[in-house]
Interface confidence: medium
Amino acid sequence: LQVTVPDKKKVAMLFQPTVLRCHFSTSSHQPAVVQWKFKSYCQDRMGESLGMSSPRAQALSKRNLEWDPYLDCLDSRRTVRVVASKQGSTVTLGDFYRGREITIVHDADLQIGKLMWGDSGLYYCIITTPDDLEGKNEDSVELLVLGRTGLLADLLPSFAVEIMPE
Protein backbone atom coordinates (compact mmCIF):
# COMPACT_ATOMS: atom_id res chain seq x y z
CA LEU A 1 0.00 0.00 0.00
CA GLN A 2 1.33 3.42 -0.93
CA VAL A 3 -0.48 6.67 -0.04
CA THR A 4 0.67 10.02 -1.43
CA VAL A 5 -0.66 13.53 -0.95
CA PRO A 6 0.90 15.55 -3.81
CA ASP A 7 0.54 19.00 -2.21
CA LYS A 8 2.36 19.27 1.10
CA LYS A 9 1.07 22.80 1.76
CA LYS A 10 -2.03 24.36 0.27
CA VAL A 11 -3.19 27.97 0.61
CA ALA A 12 -6.87 28.55 -0.10
CA MET A 13 -9.38 31.36 0.21
CA LEU A 14 -11.97 31.82 2.92
CA PHE A 15 -15.53 30.91 1.80
CA GLN A 16 -14.16 29.39 -1.42
CA PRO A 17 -14.07 25.67 -2.38
CA THR A 18 -10.92 23.57 -2.36
CA VAL A 19 -9.86 20.00 -3.06
CA LEU A 20 -7.20 18.18 -1.04
CA ARG A 21 -5.81 15.48 -3.28
CA CYS A 22 -4.79 11.99 -2.19
CA HIS A 23 -3.49 9.15 -4.36
CA PHE A 24 -3.05 5.55 -3.34
CA SER A 25 -1.94 2.33 -4.95
CA THR A 26 -2.53 -1.11 -3.51
CA SER A 27 -2.13 -4.76 -4.42
CA SER A 28 -5.46 -5.48 -2.75
CA HIS A 29 -8.52 -6.37 -4.78
CA GLN A 30 -10.80 -5.49 -1.89
CA PRO A 31 -12.35 -1.99 -1.72
CA ALA A 32 -10.27 0.42 0.36
CA VAL A 33 -11.66 2.46 3.26
CA VAL A 34 -10.69 6.13 2.87
CA GLN A 35 -10.61 8.40 5.90
CA TRP A 36 -9.69 12.09 6.09
CA LYS A 37 -8.69 13.32 9.54
CA PHE A 38 -8.19 16.95 10.63
CA LYS A 39 -5.57 17.98 13.18
CA SER A 40 -5.39 21.59 14.35
CA TYR A 41 -2.10 23.42 14.75
CA CYS A 42 -0.23 22.71 17.96
CA GLN A 43 -0.69 24.88 21.01
CA ASP A 44 2.19 27.11 22.04
CA ARG A 45 2.94 24.82 24.97
CA MET A 46 3.32 21.74 22.80
CA GLY A 47 7.04 21.73 23.71
CA GLU A 48 6.10 20.48 27.17
CA SER A 49 4.19 17.56 25.72
CA LEU A 50 7.18 16.60 23.62
CA GLY A 51 9.50 16.80 26.63
CA MET A 52 11.24 19.81 25.11
CA SER A 53 11.03 22.17 28.06
CA SER A 54 14.62 21.78 29.23
CA PRO A 55 17.37 23.91 27.63
CA ARG A 56 19.12 20.74 26.46
CA ALA A 57 15.93 19.42 24.83
CA GLN A 58 15.30 22.80 23.21
CA ALA A 59 18.81 22.75 21.76
CA LEU A 60 18.18 19.25 20.43
CA SER A 61 14.91 20.31 18.82
CA LYS A 62 16.61 23.27 17.14
CA ARG A 63 19.17 20.93 15.62
CA ASN A 64 16.41 18.66 14.33
CA LEU A 65 15.31 20.63 11.28
CA GLU A 66 12.51 18.14 10.61
CA TRP A 67 10.71 19.16 13.80
CA ASP A 68 7.96 21.72 13.12
CA PRO A 69 6.44 23.33 16.23
CA TYR A 70 3.21 24.13 14.39
CA LEU A 71 2.61 20.55 13.36
CA ASP A 72 4.58 18.16 15.54
CA CYS A 73 2.97 17.51 18.90
CA LEU A 74 0.89 14.95 20.71
CA ASP A 75 -2.75 14.78 19.65
CA SER A 76 -3.73 15.61 23.24
CA ARG A 77 -2.29 19.07 22.61
CA ARG A 78 -4.58 19.86 19.71
CA THR A 79 -7.99 19.21 18.19
CA VAL A 80 -8.32 15.99 16.20
CA ARG A 81 -11.47 15.22 14.21
CA VAL A 82 -12.62 12.78 11.53
CA VAL A 83 -13.69 14.92 8.56
CA ALA A 84 -15.10 12.23 6.30
CA SER A 85 -14.87 8.52 5.53
CA LYS A 86 -15.64 6.60 2.36
CA GLN A 87 -16.43 2.90 2.11
CA GLY A 88 -17.42 1.77 -1.36
CA SER A 89 -19.57 4.60 -2.70
CA THR A 90 -20.84 5.69 0.73
CA VAL A 91 -19.36 8.88 2.19
CA THR A 92 -19.96 9.61 5.88
CA LEU A 93 -19.13 13.00 7.42
CA GLY A 94 -17.72 13.35 10.92
CA ASP A 95 -20.10 14.84 13.50
CA PHE A 96 -18.42 18.25 13.48
CA TYR A 97 -18.68 18.53 9.69
CA ARG A 98 -22.32 17.44 9.26
CA GLY A 99 -24.30 19.89 7.18
CA ARG A 100 -21.25 21.17 5.31
CA GLU A 101 -20.58 20.68 1.61
CA ILE A 102 -17.84 18.11 2.06
CA THR A 103 -17.36 14.84 0.22
CA ILE A 104 -14.70 12.42 -0.99
CA VAL A 105 -14.29 12.32 -4.77
CA HIS A 106 -12.03 10.53 -7.28
CA ASP A 107 -11.40 7.63 -4.92
CA ALA A 108 -9.69 9.64 -2.16
CA ASP A 109 -9.72 13.42 -2.78
CA LEU A 110 -11.37 15.54 -0.08
CA GLN A 111 -13.62 18.19 -1.58
CA ILE A 112 -14.65 21.10 0.65
CA GLY A 113 -17.36 23.36 -0.76
CA LYS A 114 -16.88 26.45 1.39
CA LEU A 115 -13.85 26.99 3.59
CA MET A 116 -14.44 28.33 7.10
CA TRP A 117 -12.29 30.18 9.64
CA GLY A 118 -11.33 27.09 11.61
CA ASP A 119 -10.37 24.89 8.66
CA SER A 120 -6.66 25.76 8.73
CA GLY A 121 -4.57 22.85 9.92
CA LEU A 122 -3.23 19.46 8.96
CA TYR A 123 -5.33 16.99 6.97
CA TYR A 124 -4.43 13.29 6.93
CA CYS A 125 -5.51 10.95 4.17
CA ILE A 126 -5.63 7.45 5.73
CA ILE A 127 -6.24 4.37 3.58
CA THR A 128 -7.13 0.98 5.04
CA THR A 129 -7.21 -2.20 3.00
CA PRO A 130 -7.98 -5.59 4.59
CA ASP A 131 -5.27 -7.56 2.80
CA ASP A 132 -2.51 -5.03 2.04
CA LEU A 133 -0.93 -4.00 5.33
CA GLU A 134 2.59 -3.29 4.12
CA GLY A 135 3.90 0.13 3.07
CA LYS A 136 2.68 3.62 3.88
CA ASN A 137 -1.02 3.93 4.69
CA GLU A 138 -1.27 7.71 5.33
CA ASP A 139 0.03 11.09 4.19
CA SER A 140 -0.82 14.67 5.10
CA VAL A 141 -1.33 18.14 3.65
CA GLU A 142 -1.26 21.44 5.51
CA LEU A 143 -4.14 23.75 4.63
CA LEU A 144 -3.95 27.48 5.34
CA VAL A 145 -7.16 29.46 4.89
CA LEU A 146 -6.72 33.18 4.24
CA GLY A 147 -9.11 36.06 3.73
CA ARG A 148 -8.63 39.25 1.74
CA THR A 149 -5.84 41.06 3.56
CA GLY A 150 -4.07 44.33 2.80
CA LEU A 151 -0.82 42.73 3.91
CA LEU A 152 -1.06 40.27 1.03
CA ALA A 153 -3.14 42.27 -1.45
CA ASP A 154 -0.29 43.33 -3.71
CA LEU A 155 1.64 40.07 -3.27
CA LEU A 156 -1.24 37.67 -3.84
CA PRO A 157 -3.93 39.59 -5.71
CA SER A 158 -6.11 36.52 -5.98
CA PHE A 159 -6.79 36.74 -2.25
CA ALA A 160 -9.71 39.07 -3.04
CA VAL A 161 -12.37 37.15 -1.19
CA GLU A 162 -14.96 37.81 1.47
CA ILE A 163 -14.14 37.89 5.13
CA MET A 164 -16.48 37.58 8.05
CA PRO A 165 -16.04 39.65 11.22
CA GLU A 166 -15.93 37.73 14.49
Partner: antibody, heavy 120, light 112 residues
Framework: QVQLVQSGAEVKKPGSSVKVSCKAS????????ISWVRQAPGQGLEWMGG????????NYAQKFQGRVTITADKSTSTAYMELSSLRSEDTAVYYC?????????????WGQGTLVTVSS | DIVMTQSPLSLPVTPGEPASISCRSS???????????LDWYLQKPGQSPQLLIY???NRASGVPDRFSGSGSGTDFTLKISRVEAEDVGVYYC?????????FGGGTKLEIR
Amino acid sequence: QVQLVQSGAEVKKPGSSVKVSCKASGGTFSSYAISWVRQAPGQGLEWMGGIIPILGIANYAQKFQGRVTITADKSTSTAYMELSSLRSEDTAVYYCARGRLPYGDFWDSWGQGTLVTVSS
Amino acid sequence: DIVMTQSPLSLPVTPGEPASISCRSSQSLLYSNGYNYLDWYLQKPGQSPQLLIYLGSNRASGVPDRFSGSGSGTDFTLKISRVEAEDVGVYYCMQALQTPLTFGGGTKLEIR
Protein backbone atom coordinates in the same frame (compact mmCIF):
# COMPACT_ATOMS: atom_id res chain seq x y z
CA GLN B 1 -4.20 35.60 26.81
CA VAL B 2 -1.79 36.41 23.99
CA GLN B 3 1.36 38.29 24.92
CA LEU B 4 4.03 39.79 22.71
CA VAL B 5 7.28 40.43 24.55
CA GLN B 6 9.89 42.58 22.82
CA SER B 7 13.63 42.86 23.37
CA GLY B 8 15.10 45.71 25.39
CA ALA B 9 16.08 49.26 24.48
CA GLU B 10 19.04 49.81 22.14
CA VAL B 11 21.45 52.67 21.54
CA LYS B 12 23.04 52.59 18.09
CA LYS B 13 25.50 54.60 16.05
CA PRO B 14 24.47 56.11 12.70
CA GLY B 15 25.14 53.68 9.84
CA SER B 16 24.80 50.59 12.03
CA SER B 17 21.95 48.07 12.24
CA VAL B 18 19.50 47.05 14.93
CA LYS B 19 17.55 43.82 15.31
CA VAL B 20 14.47 43.84 17.53
CA SER B 21 12.77 40.61 18.60
CA CYS B 22 9.13 39.92 19.45
CA LYS B 23 8.24 36.67 21.21
CA ALA B 24 4.64 35.47 21.13
CA SER B 25 3.07 33.35 23.83
CA GLY B 26 -0.44 32.24 24.71
CA GLY B 27 -1.69 31.50 21.20
CA THR B 28 -0.84 29.53 18.10
CA PHE B 29 1.85 31.51 16.24
CA SER B 30 0.77 29.84 13.01
CA SER B 31 -2.63 31.54 13.02
CA TYR B 32 -1.31 35.08 12.94
CA ALA B 33 0.36 37.80 10.94
CA ILE B 34 2.92 40.04 12.62
CA SER B 35 3.39 43.70 11.71
CA TRP B 36 5.98 46.22 12.84
CA VAL B 37 4.97 49.80 13.57
CA ARG B 38 7.19 52.61 14.77
CA GLN B 39 6.56 55.86 16.60
CA ALA B 40 9.09 58.68 16.64
CA PRO B 41 9.14 60.83 19.82
CA GLY B 42 5.95 62.88 20.01
CA GLN B 43 4.82 61.62 16.60
CA GLY B 44 2.15 59.29 15.21
CA LEU B 45 2.25 55.66 14.14
CA GLU B 46 4.02 54.43 11.01
CA TRP B 47 3.69 50.92 9.52
CA MET B 48 7.02 49.44 8.43
CA GLY B 49 6.05 46.00 7.21
CA GLY B 50 4.60 42.66 8.16
CA ILE B 51 5.01 38.94 7.83
CA ILE B 52 2.77 35.88 7.78
CA PRO B 53 5.10 33.41 9.52
CA ILE B 54 3.40 30.24 8.29
CA LEU B 55 3.77 31.39 4.68
CA GLY B 56 7.14 33.04 5.16
CA ILE B 57 5.83 35.99 3.14
CA ALA B 58 6.90 39.48 4.19
CA ASN B 59 5.73 42.81 2.83
CA TYR B 60 7.47 46.15 3.44
CA ALA B 61 6.51 49.78 3.17
CA GLN B 62 8.29 51.31 0.17
CA LYS B 63 9.87 53.90 2.46
CA PHE B 64 11.85 51.16 4.24
CA GLN B 65 12.43 48.84 1.27
CA GLY B 66 16.04 47.67 1.19
CA ARG B 67 16.69 48.79 4.77
CA VAL B 68 14.26 46.62 6.72
CA THR B 69 14.08 42.83 6.98
CA ILE B 70 11.28 41.08 8.84
CA THR B 71 11.65 37.40 9.66
CA ALA B 72 10.01 34.83 11.91
CA ASP B 73 11.37 31.77 13.68
CA LYS B 74 8.57 29.22 14.02
CA SER B 75 10.50 27.06 16.49
CA THR B 76 10.60 29.85 19.08
CA SER B 77 7.41 31.75 18.08
CA THR B 78 9.57 34.85 17.63
CA ALA B 79 9.44 37.55 14.97
CA TYR B 80 12.34 39.87 14.17
CA MET B 81 12.70 43.27 12.59
CA GLU B 82 16.15 44.35 11.42
CA LEU B 83 16.72 47.93 10.29
CA SER B 84 20.04 48.82 8.68
CA SER B 85 21.88 52.04 7.72
CA LEU B 86 20.46 53.74 10.80
CA ARG B 87 20.16 57.52 10.91
CA SER B 88 19.09 59.89 13.68
CA GLU B 89 15.53 60.07 12.35
CA ASP B 90 15.16 56.33 13.01
CA THR B 91 15.12 57.11 16.73
CA ALA B 92 11.71 55.78 17.76
CA VAL B 93 9.76 53.23 19.74
CA TYR B 94 9.32 50.11 17.60
CA TYR B 95 6.23 47.97 18.20
CA CYS B 96 5.33 44.52 16.98
CA ALA B 97 1.63 43.78 16.63
CA ARG B 98 -0.31 40.58 16.00
CA GLY B 99 -3.26 40.14 13.65
CA ARG B 100 -5.31 36.96 13.54
CA LEU B 101 -5.63 35.13 10.24
CA PRO B 102 -7.43 34.78 7.91
CA TYR B 103 -7.55 38.59 8.00
CA GLY B 104 -4.34 39.63 9.75
CA ASP B 105 -4.48 43.41 9.30
CA PHE B 106 -6.22 44.45 12.50
CA TRP B 107 -3.88 44.07 15.44
CA ASP B 108 -5.50 42.83 18.62
CA SER B 109 -2.27 42.41 20.56
CA TRP B 110 0.80 44.66 20.75
CA GLY B 111 4.27 44.34 22.22
CA GLN B 112 5.38 46.75 24.93
CA GLY B 113 7.61 48.61 22.45
CA THR B 114 11.38 48.83 22.07
CA LEU B 115 13.08 52.21 22.17
CA VAL B 116 15.86 52.49 19.60
CA THR B 117 18.05 55.57 19.96
CA VAL B 118 20.39 56.46 17.10
CA SER B 119 23.10 58.83 18.23
CA SER B 120 26.74 59.44 17.52
CA ASP C 1 -0.17 55.67 -0.79
CA ILE C 2 -3.57 56.22 0.81
CA VAL C 3 -3.56 59.39 2.93
CA MET C 4 -5.61 59.35 6.13
CA THR C 5 -6.76 62.68 7.60
CA GLN C 6 -8.19 62.94 11.09
CA SER C 7 -10.05 65.76 12.80
CA PRO C 8 -10.04 67.37 15.24
CA LEU C 9 -6.41 67.35 16.30
CA SER C 10 -7.42 67.86 19.91
CA LEU C 11 -10.72 67.06 21.61
CA PRO C 12 -11.43 68.33 25.15
CA VAL C 13 -14.47 66.53 26.58
CA THR C 14 -16.40 66.62 29.85
CA PRO C 15 -16.86 63.18 31.44
CA GLY C 16 -20.30 61.75 30.64
CA GLU C 17 -20.55 63.78 27.43
CA PRO C 18 -20.36 62.22 23.93
CA ALA C 19 -17.35 62.59 21.65
CA SER C 20 -16.89 62.15 17.92
CA ILE C 21 -13.73 61.80 15.82
CA SER C 22 -13.68 62.00 12.04
CA CYS C 23 -11.36 60.19 9.65
CA ARG C 24 -11.18 60.72 5.91
CA SER C 25 -9.23 58.64 3.37
CA SER C 26 -7.84 59.81 0.04
CA GLN C 27 -9.52 56.87 -1.70
CA SER C 28 -12.41 54.56 -0.93
CA LEU C 29 -11.74 51.84 1.65
CA LEU C 30 -14.88 49.93 0.66
CA TYR C 31 -13.85 46.65 -0.93
CA SER C 32 -15.99 44.55 -3.27
CA ASN C 33 -16.77 42.13 -0.42
CA GLY C 34 -18.79 44.89 1.27
CA TYR C 35 -16.33 45.62 4.07
CA ASN C 36 -14.58 48.89 4.81
CA TYR C 37 -10.91 48.26 5.54
CA LEU C 38 -10.68 50.84 8.31
CA ASP C 39 -9.58 50.22 11.90
CA TRP C 40 -9.49 52.44 14.99
CA TYR C 41 -6.81 52.31 17.70
CA LEU C 42 -6.39 54.06 21.03
CA GLN C 43 -3.00 54.79 22.53
CA LYS C 44 -3.30 55.67 26.19
CA PRO C 45 -0.50 57.76 27.75
CA GLY C 46 2.69 55.72 28.13
CA GLN C 47 1.12 52.57 26.66
CA SER C 48 1.12 50.59 23.42
CA PRO C 49 -1.82 51.15 21.06
CA GLN C 50 -4.92 48.97 21.48
CA LEU C 51 -7.50 47.91 18.92
CA LEU C 52 -10.97 49.42 19.31
CA ILE C 53 -12.80 48.91 16.00
CA TYR C 54 -12.00 46.81 12.95
CA LEU C 55 -13.50 46.72 9.47
CA GLY C 56 -15.15 50.08 10.03
CA SER C 57 -17.76 49.11 12.58
CA ASN C 58 -16.84 45.90 14.44
CA ARG C 59 -15.94 46.34 18.10
CA ALA C 60 -12.86 44.41 19.17
CA SER C 61 -13.06 41.90 22.00
CA GLY C 62 -13.28 43.55 25.42
CA VAL C 63 -14.02 47.04 24.07
CA PRO C 64 -16.89 48.76 25.94
CA ASP C 65 -20.09 49.27 23.94
CA ARG C 66 -19.88 53.03 24.39
CA PHE C 67 -17.41 52.92 21.47
CA SER C 68 -18.87 52.63 17.98
CA GLY C 69 -17.52 52.99 14.45
CA SER C 70 -19.49 54.05 11.39
CA GLY C 71 -19.04 55.34 7.86
CA SER C 72 -18.24 53.95 4.46
CA GLY C 73 -16.04 54.66 1.47
CA THR C 74 -13.90 57.65 2.41
CA ASP C 75 -15.65 59.11 5.49
CA PHE C 76 -15.57 57.42 8.87
CA THR C 77 -16.50 58.34 12.43
CA LEU C 78 -15.58 56.99 15.84
CA LYS C 79 -18.16 57.84 18.49
CA ILE C 80 -17.94 57.55 22.27
CA SER C 81 -21.44 57.79 23.71
CA ARG C 82 -20.33 58.83 27.21
CA VAL C 83 -16.68 59.70 27.74
CA GLU C 84 -14.98 58.31 30.84
CA ALA C 85 -11.69 59.41 32.39
CA GLU C 86 -10.00 56.20 31.22
CA ASP C 87 -10.72 57.09 27.58
CA VAL C 88 -7.99 59.75 27.43
CA GLY C 89 -5.24 59.21 24.89
CA VAL C 90 -4.58 59.52 21.19
CA TYR C 91 -7.03 57.91 18.75
CA TYR C 92 -5.75 56.75 15.37
CA CYS C 93 -7.62 55.52 12.31
CA MET C 94 -5.76 53.16 9.97
CA GLN C 95 -6.52 51.88 6.48
CA ALA C 96 -5.85 48.20 5.82
CA LEU C 97 -7.00 48.10 2.21
CA GLN C 98 -3.52 48.08 0.71
CA THR C 99 0.11 48.43 1.64
CA PRO C 100 1.61 50.53 2.94
CA LEU C 101 -0.95 50.41 5.71
CA THR C 102 -1.32 54.06 6.75
CA PHE C 103 -2.51 55.87 9.87
CA GLY C 104 -4.23 59.16 10.44
CA GLY C 105 -2.27 61.80 12.35
CA GLY C 106 -4.16 61.11 15.57
CA THR C 107 -6.74 62.88 17.71
CA LYS C 108 -5.83 63.67 21.32
CA LEU C 109 -8.81 63.26 23.63
CA GLU C 110 -8.44 65.01 26.96
CA ILE C 111 -10.75 65.49 29.89
CA ARG C 112 -11.97 69.03 30.36
